[in-house]
């Protein structure tokens, strides 16, 4: 019968007793940077080309015995997960292996860099079809390794890496922390985060999605017909590398940004029990488990968006947080979140020709996050309109005044430090459709976009009674592009998007202050792309 | 995802002049030294010297050669293990940590990172 991990990544309507994906990834080459491999294993024989690249440190210990089966164990298993005949994801994908990890599974940043350069040289000498690079390894945060991954990604290569097995924030490890890399955490057969003894999957904002990574049966280097169970974020990353190979084989022109958005779009949503993660990481960690797309890889022209969290700003009075989209993505909105509620809002500004989402801490605050909504909007022309803060007691209005531009998001930034004297701003859909409205000392920023067939609308949901959060979702066919909070009490923690759900968070202590008439409102901007239609604001 | 996280960045305290060499004194080090926050994962003695993005091929080689020459003047032998051209401009060098201050003052140097271990996951 079909192994649990292959069943899990297969869309329900394609599940049968046998795993038979519609396309085997045959147009894609997957590079594996790992240990040596047993290339004559029946699972991968004829599918993996062992390159002459080898850059590994010496094994520890004077009496270390190099046993081929042990040396090849990790790499052989992963090659099997990606493209194995019986237990592989992309059975048609061809692979090339580079040895950057020794018999103990240890490598170096420098060896990995030289391996990545080897791939780049190969690509320059003989350009082939789409390339996927699987990096099933992790070290401490490395600026140079992240930079090398960025360069390779910008050369059109898809890099997939393990989040790490240290039960820690993936942002503290490389290449997991590189924004251009697709970083994969591990889940088990119960869709729970993998935890085995003291080890477990890494988590946090640097993880893009999760995939099966516990008790994965794959090729064993003990003999040419042996199989073994291995676990970890390497196995999870290998699943995603296989899925990426399948997607790229079906649509070879997909860019990295498109591929990442599709991986997120087709993932199983909200199946992971987030309580396993440390409390401060739960909101930052994506609740996504990778699955193959249905046989038609089209997204039905749906607008694809993802949420990108910044690093924590830190607690200083003027600390700022910055969230960035990928170069091909449009930043459609920017919001902010602070656990203490002490924040001075968020705004969009251009840095080096790219729009970024910024958030500002407030005096006495423990720090903020900036939350960017990053979308793929074909042929988009987007701009930011902002209005300085109005005098006390007056409202500030900003709308999209250019023809055919629609409002995709609002941001608000307060000049005042004292959080108690102001009412927080929000967009108001009933009185002023398509406008951002700010109150009392708020600078208001409207994100306005023009794209063929782009239409947007505001959807609000309010709760009067005590509640830690208020949510509003965009309906099927619509995509959340903006999310804001209009408080019923003076202190809100902020707002952020989780898939198609806008979440407005309220401070615990504010609940007691509420009077029944003061509703806390989550306000979502929902957009869709209908290529045949004109850009419009839906009332 | 692009922040430095739990990471060591050190601005080395450098004298304004070394051995009275005018060309060295002219260049004030703005480059930083970086290393893994986990001490057990560090590989002291091997360093990745990363040069500014627009550095030309010939300049990479010249910078590596200049480091070797200046190290030799101080009685140190250094070994250039690899030159990076295709992904980023830079080179991998085996040398004493005593030479980091000197290396950081070289023209075109953006930062230097101590090599460290990575592990199968």
């Amino acid at each position: 019968s079909i192994p649990w991990n292959l069943e899990r990544i297969t869309p329900p309507r394609y599940r049968a007793d046998e795993y038979q994906p519609p396309d085997g990834g045959s147009l894609v080459e997957v590079y594996l940077l790992d240990t040596s491999i047993q290339s004559d294993h029946r699972e991968i024989e004829g599918r993996v080309m062992v390159t002459d690249f080898e850059n590994v440190p010496e094994e520890d210990g004077t009496r270390f015995h190099r046993q081929a089966s042990k040396c090849d164990s990790h790499g052989t298993h992963l090659a099997g997960v990606v493209s194995g005949r019986d237990a592989g994801v992309a059975k048609g994908a061809s692979m090339r292996s580079l040895r950057v990890l020794n018999c103990q599974g240890k490598g170096t940043v420098s060896g990995t860099l030289i391996g990545l350069e080897f791939i780049r040289k190969s690509q320059l000498v003989q350009p082939v079809g789409p390339l996927v690079v699987l990096l099933p390894l992790a070290g401490g945060y490395s600026r140079v390794l992240n930079a090398a991954c960025q360069r390779l990604a910008r050369a059109g290569v898809v890099l997939v890496t393990a989040a790490g097995n240290f039960r820690d924030d993936a942002c503290l490890y490389s290449p997991a922390s590189a924004p251009e890399v697709i970083t994969v955490g591990a889940t088990n057969a119960q869709d729970q985060p993998v935890t085995l003894g003291t080890l477990g999957t890494n988590f946090g904002r640097c993880v893009d999605l999760f995939a099966p990574g516990e008790d994965i049966i794959g090729a064993s280097s003990d003999c040419s017909t042996c199989f073994v169970s291995q676990s970890g974020t390497s196995q999870a990353a290998a699943h995603v590398a296989g899925i990426a190979a399948m997607m790229l084989s079906a649509e070879p022109e997909l860019t990295l940004a498109e591929l990442r958005q599709r991986l997120i779009h087709f993932s199983a949503k909200d199946v992971i029990n987030m309580a396993w993660f440390p409390e401060d990481q739960q909101v930052l960690t994506p609740n996504l488990v990778a699955t193959l797309p249905p046989s038609t890889h089209e997204t039905g022209g749906q607008l694809l968006c993802r949420t990108v969290w910044s690093a924590h700003s830190g607690p200083t009075r003027t600390a700022t947080a910055t969230a960035r989209c990928a170069p091909e993505e449009e930043l459609l909105s920017c919001s902010s979140f602070s656990r203490s509620g002490r924040r001075r809002g968020d705004w969009i500004e251009a840095i080096g020709g790219q729009q970024v989402c910024k958030a500002l801490n407030a005096f006495g605050g423990e720090g903020v996050y900036a939350v960017a909504r990053c979308c793929l909007v074909p042929r988009a022309n987007c701009s930011i309109h902002n209005t300085p803060a109005a005098r006390a007691g007056l409202e500030t209005h900003v709308h999209c005044h250019q023809k055919d531009h629609v409002l995709t998001g609002c941001s608000f930034h307060w000049e005042v430090e004292d959080l108690s004297v102001r009412r927080q701003p929000a967009l108001r859909s009933r009185r002023q459709p398509g406008q951002c409205v700010g109150h009392q000392a708020a600078s208001v920023y409207a994100s306005c976009c023009h794209a063929p067939g782009l239409e947007c609308k505001i959807k609000e949901h309010g709760i009067s009674g005590p509640s830690e959060q208020v949510t509003v979702a965009c309906e099927a066919g619509w995509t959340l592009t903006g999310c804001n909070v209009l408080p019923g009490a003076s202190l809100t923690l902020g707002a952020y998007s989780v898939d198609n759900l806008c979440v407005a968070r309220v401070h615990d202590t504010a609940r007691a202050d509420r009077t029944s008439g003061e509703a806390t409102v989550a306000a979502a901007i929902c957009c869709r792309s209908r290529p045949s239609a004109k850009a419009s604001w839906v009332q | 995802q692009d922040e430095d996280g739990d990471y060591e960045e050190l601005m080395l305290a450098l004298p304004s002049q070394e051995d009275g060499l005018a060309d060295e004194a002219a260049h004030v080090a703005t480059a930083t030294f970086r290393r893994c926050s986990k001490e057990a994962w560090r590989l002291p003695g091997t360093y990745i010297v990363v040069l500014m993005e627009e550095t030309q091929r010939l300049q990479i080689e010249q910078t590596a050669h200049r480091l070797q020459t200046r190290a030799a003047r101080r009685g140190y032998v250094i070994k250039v293990l690899h030159i990076f051209y295709d992904l980023f401009p830079g080179f991998l060098v085996k040398m004493s940590s005593d030479l980091l201050g000197l290396a950081l003052k070289l023209p075109h140097v953006e930062y230097i990172e101590e090599d460290s271990f990575v592990f199968a996951q």
Epitope: N165, G197, D222, C223 | -
Partner: antibody, heavy 128, light 107 residues
């Protein structure tokens, strides 16, 4: 569904060799760790040893000098041989599957999910 | 070898009772522990592994806890089919060793 079935003589003479075979059905023998256990009458469970598909074995030190576990992959079977038996070797003998996975951090760890499939057991009496 | 000790050896209880069995390891075994149920003339059945993870198909009234050297098996509401002998087993190292067993009898 995986099933294990022990077979072999129910009576063995002292000083002779006890030989048992475990047949695995519903799954390939080429993935897991296959163990033998025994339980003397009215007593607790004792682990004898395991074999992996590649032929790797590990035995209980208390029995190591007398025990051999082997594997016959085409038949999907593994076997136990215990030499120089005495009355103290009288027990119900079980074969079982141990699910083990490997995970890496800085080093390699083996992680066991326990013995999740057992045979029904076969009684072996050592008597002349 | 790691020695495993169970307490009590015998336990009389009624249907609906909450039952607790304790197991001690002679050295730290982290959470590498399994619990088995065995009925007369039948092979052991795996209930819990990793000290607290319920094996697939095992009723949720069974629960495990503990780490290091002390572990507990709890049956929240004893059912007629739960009268059996229970064994703990360390999965930390070889040789795999068991506790001497706890027999749960009808009061």
């Amino acid at each position: 569904q995986v099933q294990l079935q022990e077979s072999g003589p129910g009576l063995v003479k002292p000083s002779e060799t006890l030989s048992l075979t475990c047949t695995v059905s519903g799954d390939s023998i080429n993935t897991y760790y296959w163990s033998w256990f025994r339980q003397p009458p009215g007593k607790g469970l004792e682990w004898i040893g395991y074999i992996y598909y590649s032929g790797t074995t590990n035995y209980n030190p208390s029995l190591k000098s007398r025990v051999t576990i082997s594997i016959d992959t085409p038949r999907n079977q593994f076997s136990l041989k215990l030499i120089s038996v005495t009355a103290a070797d009288t027990a119900v003998y079980y074969c079982a599957r141990e699910r083990i996975t490997m995970i890496r951090g800085v080093t390699l760890y083996y992680y066991s999910y326990g013995m999740d499939v057992w045979g029904q057991g076969t009684t072996v009496t050592v008597s002349s | 070898d790691i020695q495993m000790t169970q307490s009590p050896s015998f336990l009389s209880a009624s249907v609906g009772d909450r039952v607790t069995i304790t197991c001690w390891a002679s050295q730290d075994i982290s959470s590498y522990l399994a619990w088995y149920q065995q009925k007369p003339g039948i092979a052991p059945k795996l209930l819990i592994y990793a000290a607290s993870t319920l094996q697939s198909g095992v009723p949720s009234r069974f629960g495990g806890s503990g780490s290091g050297t002390e572990f507990t098996l709890t049956i929240s509401s004893l059912q007629p089919e739960d009268f059996a002998t229970y064994y703990c087993q360390q999965l930390n190292s070889y040789p795999r060793t068991f506790g001497q067993g706890t027999k749960v009898e009808i009061k």
